[in-house]
Interface confidence: medium
């Protein structure tokens, strides 16, 4: 299964929105900001299975979606941007399950839960504990919607790796028919 | 109310297979992880697998990998346990468990529980 | 794998009395979010195990407030702080912290 080509173009579409959803300064913020610890290993690695890309961002994109749907964010945030973050979030999670299971189905196994799932919950529950001791202050979410830009683009960068991956295997697999 | 109902444990010979069930109710089955443990003779508790909402991802200890296939069919609201190559040391009350998820915290804690089903191996 | 340890029994004790029951990790439990992934099971007799504390220190729903826990991420603690007769049964440590999930051999509560 590839990617769907417009996966790409809603996780761009996905930052985009983020950056509109600014409402403060950061530079107003910068006494609250705090290190996550983004897993960075988990996007970096070079030997990458199609499975794990698309486990680590389908969980990434269900956690950011779960912390932008609560009763909290739509007090901090724009409601038409929200809807529209949730909107296309919602997109990119379909797509990627389509995807996984017939990933899966072709017995690549995703191996999801032992790496990507439990260490990005572990992850957005940082964030989580964070929103909570700010008091869910705008400083907070302005420190968090940065956080989540810097983490999507990490994870967006991994799956443009993989589509190039999967282009180089097409040609090289056309080199030797 | 929250409920897990248990079924298929059986006695089965060393090698054989057997299928456990667990139906829910009470709640949105799907959108909560779910788990079968296992409590051996001695009493202690021993985690089997554990299966997202979707069910799009699973995992084993290595005790039971490549033995037991954890699965759900979410429009019957049922959990499953296929066990196969079956050894005496999988003698135990198997119990299933829904994951804690509420709130958005995505926590593994197992917050309901069913009433357990026994399987016995021996020959 | 994450070994927990507990003793198998606690010591006796009476009703209406606070008792303690002790657990330990083979490594620390805190993770770098702030969060410890400590947890905390009952089986009262002839039933399935319940849910009492999670994350190290919070009470699941529907527990009574005489339950407390605390640690430092590998010393853990349970605490009744007025044992009543239906607070008999096995306790079990477990850890979330990684894969595979373990829990401890279990503790029984003895009443004098």
């Known amino acids: 299964c590839d990617l769907p080509q417009n996966h790409g173009l809603l996780s761009r579409n996905t930052l985009v929105l983020l950056h509109q959803m600014r409402r403060i300064s950061p530079f107003l913020c910068l006494k609250d900001r705090r290190d996550f610890r983004f897993p960075q290993e988990m996007v970096k690695g070079s030997q990458l299975q199609k499975a794990q890309v698309m486990s680590v961002l389908h969980e990434m994109l269900q956690q950011i979606f779960s912390l932008f749907h609560t009763e909290r964010s739509s007090a901090a945030w724009n409601m038409t941007l929200l809807d529209q973050l949730h909107t296309g979030l919602h997109q990119q999670l379909q797509h990627l399950e389509t995807c996984l299971l017939q990933v899966m189905g072709e017995g690549e196994s995703a191996g999801a839960i032992s790496s990507p799932a439990l260490t990005l919950r572990r992850y957005f529950q940082g964030i989580r504990v964070y929103l909570k001791e700010k008091k869910y202050s705008d400083c907070a979410w302005e420190v968090v919607r940065m956080e989540i830009m810097k983490s999507l683009f990490l994870s967006t960068n991994m799956q443009e790796r993989l589509r190039s991956k999967d282009r180089d295997l097409g040609s090289s697999r056309n080199d030797s028919h | 109310e929250v409920q897990l109902q248990q079924s298929g444990g059986d006695l089965v010979k060393p090698g054989g297979s057997l299928k456990l069930s667990c139906a829910a109710s009470?709640?949105?089955?799907?959108?909560?992880?779910m788990s079968w443990v296992r409590q051996t003779p001695d009493k202690r508790l021993d985690w089997v697998s554990i299966i997202t909402s979707g069910g799009s991802y699973t995992y084993y200890p290595d005790s039971v990998k490549g033995r037991f296939t954890i699965s759900r069919d979410n429009a019957k609201n049922t959990l499953y346990l296929q066990m196969s190559s079956l050894k005496s040391e999988d003698t135990a009350m198997y119990y299933c468990?829904?994951?804690?998820?509420?709130?958005?915290?995505?926590?593994?804690?197992?917050?309901?529980w069913g009433q357990g089903t026994s399987v016995t191996v021996s020959s | 794998d994450i070994v927990m340890t507990q003793a198998a029994f606690s010591n006796p004790v009476t009703l209406g009395t606070s008792a303690s029951i002790s657990c330990r990790s083979s490594?620390?439990?805190?993770?770098?979010?702030?969060?410890?992934?400590l947890y905390w099971y009952l089986q009262k007799p002839g039933q399935s195990p319940q849910l009492l504390i999670y994350?190290?220190?919070n009470l699941a729903s529907g527990v009574p407030d005489r339950f407390s826990s605390s640690g430092s991420g590998i010393d853990f603690t349970l605490r009744i702080s007025r044992v009543e007769a239906e607070d008999v049964g096995a306790y079990y440590c477990a850890q979330n912290l990684e894969l595979p999930f373990t829990f401890g051999s279990g503790t029984k509560l003895e009443i004098k």
């Open positions: 490594k620390s439990l805190l993770h770098s979010n702030g969060i410890t992934y």
């Open positions: 009470g709640f949105t089955f799907s959108s909560y992880g």
């Open positions: 994350q190290m220190s």
């Open positions: 468990a829904r994951h804690a998820e509420g709130g958005g915290n995505y926590d593994y804690a197992m917050d309901y």
